[in-house]
C-alpha cells in the first residue's frame, strides 16, 4: 500500500509512519516505529510545553525579574508558562510583560478616566467645563466645581479645569 501522506489529529508523519504527538507537558524522546509507540518524557522543573508536540526540548518558564519591577502573577506548570505582572504602581510595557514602568499620573487639569492595572497604564482625560483637578495623580478623577447656590453663596471667582470656583456671601441689599 501507499505510505500515508497525512495523519490524524495529534499525530505526525515520519519515516512513512504516523506517530502520536507528545501531550502537553511532555517532550519527544524517540519517534514511534512500526512496533513501538512514540516515547515522551515529562518536562522538568521550571519547564513547559503547552501543545501536543514533537519538541525534543521543553521551554523554560518565563522569569519574572524583580529588578524590572516584575512579579509572578501565575506560577507556571509543565503545561503552562509563568505569567508575570508588575509590582503595585507599575504596569507592563508590552503584552509579553517583559518589563514595567511607573503608572502615569494625570496632571492638573486632567483626571483619571481609567485607573492603571498591572498591564495597562493610567488613562487621563481633560476635565470638562464644570470639573477640575488641581493635583497630579494616578487615582484622582476630575471633581465637579462646588455649587455655590446650594450653599446660599454666590460665585466670587470662576472655576477652571485646574481650580474650583470660589464662593462668597451674597451682597446684602441696602435699606
Amino acid at each position: 500500500p501507499e505510505p500515508p501522506t497525512a495523519c490524524r489529529e495529534k499525530q505526525y508523519l515520519i519515516n512513512s509512519q504516523c506517530c502520536s504527538l507528545c501531550q502537553p507537558g511532555q517532550k519527544l524522546v524517540s519517534d514511534c516505529t512500526e512496533f513501538t509507540e512514540t516515547e515522551c518524557l515529562p518536562c522538568g522543573e521550571s519547564e513547559f510545553l503547552d501543545t501536543w508536540n514533537r519538541e525534543t526540548h521543553c521551554h523554560q518558564h518565563k522569569y519574572c525579574d524583580p529588578n524590572l519591577g516584575l512579579r509572578v502573577q501565575q506560577k507556571g506548570t509543565s503545561e503552562t508558562d509563568t505569567i508575570c505582572t508588575c509590582e503595585e504602581g507599575w504596569h507592563c510595557t508590552s503584552e509579553a510583560c517583559e518589563s514595567c514602568v511607573l503608572h502615569r499620573s494625570c496632571s492638573p487639569g486632567f483626571g483619571v478616566k481609567q485607573i492603571a492595572t498591572g498591564v495597562s497604564d493610567t488613562i487621563c482625560e481633560p476635565c470638562p467645563v464644570g470639573f477640575f483637578s488641581n493635583v497630579s495623580s494616578a487615582f484622582e478623577k476630575c471633581h465637579p466645581w462646588t455649587s455655590c447656590e446650594t450653599k446660599d453663596l454666590v460665585v466670587q471667582q470662576a472655576g477652571t479645569n485646574k481650580t474650583d470656583v470660589v464662593c462668597g456671601p451674597q451682597d446684602r441689599l441696602r435699606a
Partner: antibody, heavy 123, light 107 residues
C-alpha cells in the same frame, strides 16, 4: 478453533532445500503478521523472519543468519504460511515453529504458536 | 542486535515457592519485553507482554515488572504445572531476540 499446524519437516542433506507449511484456522489470516521461530535441539528460541499483513503489503523481514537463503510467503486464500529453505546447513537443524505476531504499539508479541516441525540437516 | 541475558539459567524450587527470573537487555528496551513458557516437546506459550500485561487466560500468580534494561518475571506461588522453561523476548528492535531461557525444576 484458533490454531496453527506446521508440516513439511524432515531430513535433508547440507546444501539442499525444503519447504515448510503452516495452516492457520479460526482467525482472519490476512490481518496478521506471521512469523517463523526456530529452536535447535536443547537450545533456546531464535526468530527467523516474518511476513507482514495485507494492510502492509505482505513484505518480509529476516534474521541475518537466514537472509538470502530463506523466503517467507503466504497464500491468504488457503490461510497458509510458507518457509522456503535453500542452501541448508547443519546449523539450520531445529524445530521450526510458525507463530502469529500480534499486538498494538504498546507491545507486539507471539501470541499463537504451532506445534512445530523438525528439520534435520545432515549427510 | 540487542542481546538478552536471562538469569539464572536454571533453578530448583518447591511447590508454593515464590520464584523470580530476571532478564537483562544489552540496551534500554522501553518495556517492550515479553515472557513465554515452554514445556518439553511443546510450543512456547505467551504469558506476559509489554513487561507487565498478563495474556488472557494466564493465572494471576504470574507477574512481570521492570524498566530500562532490567526486567523480572515472578511466580508468586509455584504450582506443579509451572515447572517449565521460561524465555524473555525483546520487541523493540529487529531482529527480535530471546533470552537463553531459565529452566524451573522440581527440588
Amino acid at each position: 478453533e484458533v490454531q496453527l499446524v506446521e508440516s513439511g519437516g524432515g531430513l535433508v542433506q547440507p546444501g539442499g532445500s525444503l519447504r515448510l507449511s503452516c495452516a492457520a484456522s479460526g482467525f482472519t489470516f490476512s490481518d496478521y503478521y506471521m512469523s517463523w521461530v526456530r529452536q535447535a535441539p536443547g537450545k533456546g528460541l531464535e526468530w527467523v523472519g516474518f511476513i507482514r499483513n495485507k494492510a502492509n503489503g505482505y513484505t518480509t523481514e529476516y534474521a541475518a543468519s537466514v537472509k538470502g537463503r530463506f523466503t517467507i510467503s503466504r497464500d491468504n486464500s488457503k490461510s497458509t504460511l510458507y518457509l522456503q529453505m535453500n542452501s541448508l546447513r547443519a546449523e539450520d537443524t531445529a524445530v521450526y515453529y510458525c507463530a502469529r505476531y500480534g499486538g498494538l504499539k504498546k507491545g507486539w508479541y507471539f501470541d499463537l504458536w504451532g506445534q512445530g516441525t523438525l528439520v534435520t540437516v545432515s549427510s | 542486535d540487542i542481546q538478552m541475558t536471562q538469569s539464572p539459567s536454571s533453578l530448583s524450587a518447591s511447590v508454593g515457592d515464590r520464584v523470580t527470573i530476571t532478564c537483562r537487555a544489552s540496551q534500554g528496551i522501553r518495556n517492550y519485553l515479553n515472557w513465554y513458557q515452554q514445556k518439553p516437546g511443546k510450543a512456547p506459550k505467551l504469558l506476559i507482554y509489554y513487561t507487565s500485561s498478563l495474556q488472557s487466560g494466564v493465572p494471576s500468580r504470574f507477574s512481570g515488572s521492570g524498566s530500562g534494561t532490567d526486567y523480572t518475571l515472578t511466580i508468586s506461588s509455584l504450582q506443579p504445572e509451572d515447572f517449565a522453561t521460561y524465555y524473555c523476548q525483546q520487541g523493540i528492535n529487529l531482529p527480535w531476540t530471546f533470552g537463553g531461557g531459565t529452566k524451573v525444576e522440581i527440588k
